[in-house]
């Protein structure tokens, strides 16, 4: 709980704690001492949950409360207690209040009438000092309803149905110090309603329907210290001195309203204000002098607003500020000298802000800064003198490594090796498959080339992970903006798109031949080559368009360390978002649907023709084998693409997706197709197994002749063993059918399922 901790500590104890020992030890920039010992550790090892110092010093004082959270909680204890069933702790157990309503509880001079279905303020003796009327059915506070309670100090009216408060409702409450009106239906407070509350210190009006306030609203609140107006519907603050009648106001909480701008005069009288919370509003404009009068301000929270521009000197008078939150604003640019005047700043929140012009100069003057929060952990490198920098990972990378997880760091090599080896092996072996149709082979080699690019992409990512090992944070920002990252990212997209389009092309060819065998015209060399060229050109265009227009696409590939543009960031340009969606939910989803539909139709067509066949047992066997093959082709496609579609779709719905997802997708899911395509389309097909069998047979024969000069036969296990994707048992094999699918166009319907290769 950071908001206002500073103020409450000062309020109670009147002085600051120092930041702990070890400050005598001098460490170089980016390093921090391990308490009193001479050891220094880099920023990334402090506050990372691991005892790297050996004496726990690197994990001490990591909480962003500057050591005051306990005091803060103590000060607020009674505020928290108000929601409990018994908000009072009277010194004497017996009731000292005269007349007490039968359903109420009483202890000392304190009265608890919570949840008693009261419709009006009860009448009790005038010596009562605390009265809790929470969770009742009170709708109106009429004139003089508390007039006799001159000793009342605490009044709890939360969770009623109050809509109307008479201007004289609180008349006579001269001793009241705390008034809670939260969770009611108050829409307006009449100027003068608090006139008699000159001892009131806390006024809590959270979760009501207040739409406007003005300085006269608070007339009479001379002693007010804390004013909480959270979660109302205020649209503006007055262009008049808000604190005119609250000269002692220290804490103003306006979180969760609809305020859209701050005026120059609003805070002119708030010279004692220590904490100002204005997060979750709709502030879009700030004037240079808005905060000028707040020279004692310790915390300023402007998070989650609509601020686009920060005037250069907006913080120049905030000499006492120790916590500043600007998170989640669409700030376009931060001036290099924006924070120069905040010499006492200890905590700075810039989460959710894309700082395109980030530089060390911005944060260097903040010598007391101990906590900083960014949108991207890569920015931490620009604040090396700040001990605690968050986030320390984006789920993909960490401060130390491009790939945060050890599993990913190992498997990026395994997967890339499998992908590259499998595809290169197929490319090399294809010419040896005699019965293979040359055009079909060309398509398969093309597919393997595309898939091989995915392996190369993973190799490059793995290589840079090795290169940056242990100090990735120093290079992160530059790496993500580098040409290398852009090129390697476009390589991944090129691979993905060409692979997807080729699979769709191959599938459609098979689909036409199997479902419409008599319409199947064998594709000519010219057409096949044209299609392949078009697919590659399309892939190149899709992959490289984002590099051609930086204005439109921003840093399309450099949104994460693995340079893969999977899900949209809030700050990503609309163009980039649309483009990304068009690829993943347009081209790829359409292709996936075509593939699933085609294989379904093919299987159905084969199944239908098999019904008329005579050899029932053999047909069923064949169908099962075919079904298994089709299932694995569709299943691997689904395994690869469904998670990607889901992630993309969720990001489109603004669902927050953990950064870890991207890295797991890129290393384990995206390459599934690239790694398995060689197996599915080559290594398990009959022609390939024939070729292997031939090699094996020849090899054994040679070996046999060399040793005994005898003829041997290939061992039966080659044929007996059921490969997971084996099409059919050898006795059903018709070698003349294992050719390009369209060559079977004149084959009878009953033998059609033999033809699938």
């Amino acid at each position: 709980m950071t908001s206002g901790s500073v103020f409450f500590y000062i309020l109670i104890f009147g002085k600051y704690f120092s930041h702990g020992g070890g400050q005598d030890v001098k460490c170089s920039l980016g390093y921090f001492p391990c308490g009193n010992i001479t050891k220094c550790l880099p920023q990334l090892l402090h506050c990372n949950g691991v005892d790297d110092c050996g004496n726990q010093a690197d994990e001490d004082n990591c909480g962003d409360n500057n050591g005051w959270s306990l005091q803060f909680d103590k000060y607020f204890a009674s505020y928290y207690k108000m929601t409990s069933q018994y908000p009072f702790e009277a010194e004497t157990p017996e009731c000292l209040v005269g007349s007490v309503p039968v359903q109420c509880l009483c202890q000392g001079l304190e009265l608890d009438c919570d949840e008693t279905n009261l419709r009006a303020v009860p009448s009790v003796s005038s010596n009562v000092t605390a009265m809790s009327l929470q969770w009742n059915l009170i709708r109106k506070l009429p004139p003089d309803c508390f007039k006799n309670y001159h000793d009342l100090q605490k009044l709890y009216l939360q969770n009623n149905k109050i809509t109307s408060i008479s201007i004289y409702a609180f008349r006579g409450l001269n001793s009241l110090t705390k008034l809670y009106l939260s969770h009611n239906r108050i829409t307006f407070l009449k100027p003068g309603v608090f006139e008699d509350l000159h001892r009131l210190e806390w006024l809590i009006i959270e979760d009501n329907h207040l739409s406007r306030i003005s300085p006269p609203t608070f007339y009479g609140l001379n002693s007010l210290i804390l004013l909480v107006l959270m979660n109302n519907v205020l649209t503006r603050l007055p262009d008049k001195p808000l604190c005119q009648h609250m000269p002692r106001l220290h804490w103003l909480d306006l979180e969760g309203n609809h305020i859209h701008n701050l005026r120059n005069l609003t805070f002119i009288s708030c010279s004692n204000l220590t904490v100002l919370v204005m997060r979750k509003n709709k502030i879009n404009h700030l004037n240079e002098n808005t905060f000028a009068p707040l020279q004692k301000l310790d915390e300023l929270d402007l998070g989650s607003n609509k601020i686009e521009n920060l005037p250069p000197l907006i913080f120049k008078d905030l000499k006492e500020l120790s916590q500043l939150n600007l998170s989640y604003n669409p700030i376009q640019k931060i001036q290099a000298n924006q924070f120069d005047y905040l010499v006492k700043l200890k905590s700075l929140s810039l989460e959710g802000i894309e700082i395109s012009n980030i530089q060390q100069r911005m944060f260097r003057p903040l010598m007391n800064l101990s906590h900083i929060y960014f949108k991207k952990f890569q920015y931490c490198g620009y604040a090396p003198h700040v001990r605690s920098c968050k986030p320390n990972t984006d789920g993909i990378s960490s401060l130390e490594n491009l790939l945060a997880s050890i599993i990913q760091r190992v498997f990026v090599w395994v997967v890339s090796a499998v992908t590259c080896f499998g595809n290169i092996f197929v490319i090399c072996m294809r010419p040896y498959i005699r019965s293979e149709n040359k055009l079909y082979a060309m398509s398969i080699i093309s597919l393997c080339c595309a898939d091989c690019l995915m392996g190369i992409y993973l190799f490059v990512i793995g290589g840079f992970d090795l290169k940056f090992r242990g100090e990735y944070n120093k290079h992160a920002q530059l790496w993500m903006e580098s040409t290398h990252c852009q090129l390697v990212g476009s390589l991944a997209i090129l691979s993905t798109e060409v692979s997807v389009l080729l699979l769709t092309f191959l599938t459609l060819e098979k689909y036409i031949c199997i479902v419409y065998p008599f319409r199947c015209v064998r594709p000519g060399k010219c057409r096949t080559i044209t299609v392949l060229i078009l697919i590659w050109i399309t892939g190149f265009i899709v992959a490289f368009i984002p590099l051609s227009n930086k204005e439109f696409f921003k840093n399309y590939y450099g949104t994460n360390g693995v340079c893969f543009p999977l899900h949209s960031e809030d700050t990503e340009s609309i163009g980039a978002q649309i483009y990304s969606v068009a690829i993943f939910l347009g081209i790829n989803l359409a292709a996936f649907i075509i593939i699933v539909f085609s294989y379904g139709s093919m299987f159905y067509s084969v199944h239908q023709s098999a019904i008329t066949a005579t050899e029932i047992r053999n047909q069923v066997k064949k169908e099962m084998i075919l079904a298994k093959r089709f299932f694995f082709i569709v299943f691997t496609d689904a395994l690869c693409w469904i998670p990607i579609f889901v992630v993309k779709f969720l990001s489109l719905l603004q669902v927050e997706i953990p950064g870890t997802i991207t890295s797991w997708v890129v290393i384990f899911i995206l390459p599934i197709n690239s790694a398995l395509n060689p197996i599915l389309y080559t290594l398990t097909t009959r022609p390939f197994k024939e070729m292997i069998h031939r090699f094996w047979y020849n090899y054994r024969q040679r070996k046999s002749m060399d040793s005994k000069g005898q003829k041997t036969y290939a061992p039966s296990f080659i044929w007996v063993e059921m490969w997971p994707l084996q099409e059919m048992p050898p006795e059903l094999m018709k070698p003349d059918l294992f050719t390009y699918p369209c060559e079977m166009s004149l084959i009878s319907q009953s033998t059609r399922l033999n033809s699938y290769s």
């Epitope: 109307s164 201007i167 009449k190 509350l197 000159h198 001892r199 006269p216 009479g220 001379n222």
Partner: antibody, heavy 119, light 112 residues
Framework: QVQLQQPGAELVRPGASVKLSCKAS????????VNWVKQRPEEGLEWIGR????????HYNQKFKDKAILTVDKSSSTAYMQLSSLTSGDSAVYYC????????????WGHGTTLTVSS | DIVMSQSPSSLAVSAGEKVTMSCKSS????????????LAWYQQKPGQSPKLLIY???TRESGVPDRFTGSGSGTDFTLTISSVQAEDLAVYYC????????FGGGTKLEIK
Amino acid sequence: QVQLQQPGAELVRPGASVKLSCKASGYTFTSYWVNWVKQRPEEGLEWIGRIDPYDSEIHYNQKFKDKAILTVDKSSSTAYMQLSSLTSGDSAVYYCAKGGELPYYFDYWGHGTTLTVSS
Amino acid sequence: DIVMSQSPSSLAVSAGEKVTMSCKSSQNLLNSGTRKNYLAWYQQKPGQSPKLLIYWASTRESGVPDRFTGSGSGTDFTLTISSVQAEDLAVYYCKQSYNLWTFGGGTKLEIK
């Protein structure tokens, strides 16, 4: 600019009732109290009562509690005062006045309606 | 009820002279909490409606010439016109707002 428009004069018979109007413009009607003040010829000012147009909270001078009824019509930004059982003693100029930022003073006044009760 | 008494009931002065008029309250008008005196002064020129001059006993309403000054605290209050002008011919009323509202009988200012 702030204006409170009142009819110039009303003539009514004794025992009858009259409803005086005060139409406000130039400010947010529901944000400020409307007060009514009586001034007899060559006499001082007497406060009759006030109404908050926001929720129709009303406070009366006890002397006029049975004489005057205050109402508002938010849609037309108009305040009304109905005087009943009229006598010659009710003949006077009746002013409406807008409460200030704080309602302890009256920062704008209407021109007044001269009520004459006569048979 | 709080009773407000004004004196003198009328006075005649020459243009340029200084004039003071008094207003006494039957009760203390100082709010100890807000430290404000709940007293206002109004000017009513012949044939016109009243106009606010001073509130909180001494705060001049915007647009009011600075020759008008309010002073006093508790039960005794004074309105001073430092240099009377011809247009100041009017009846001046004090009004308490400590407990509802009560006007004084008024002081009629005439120009010699």
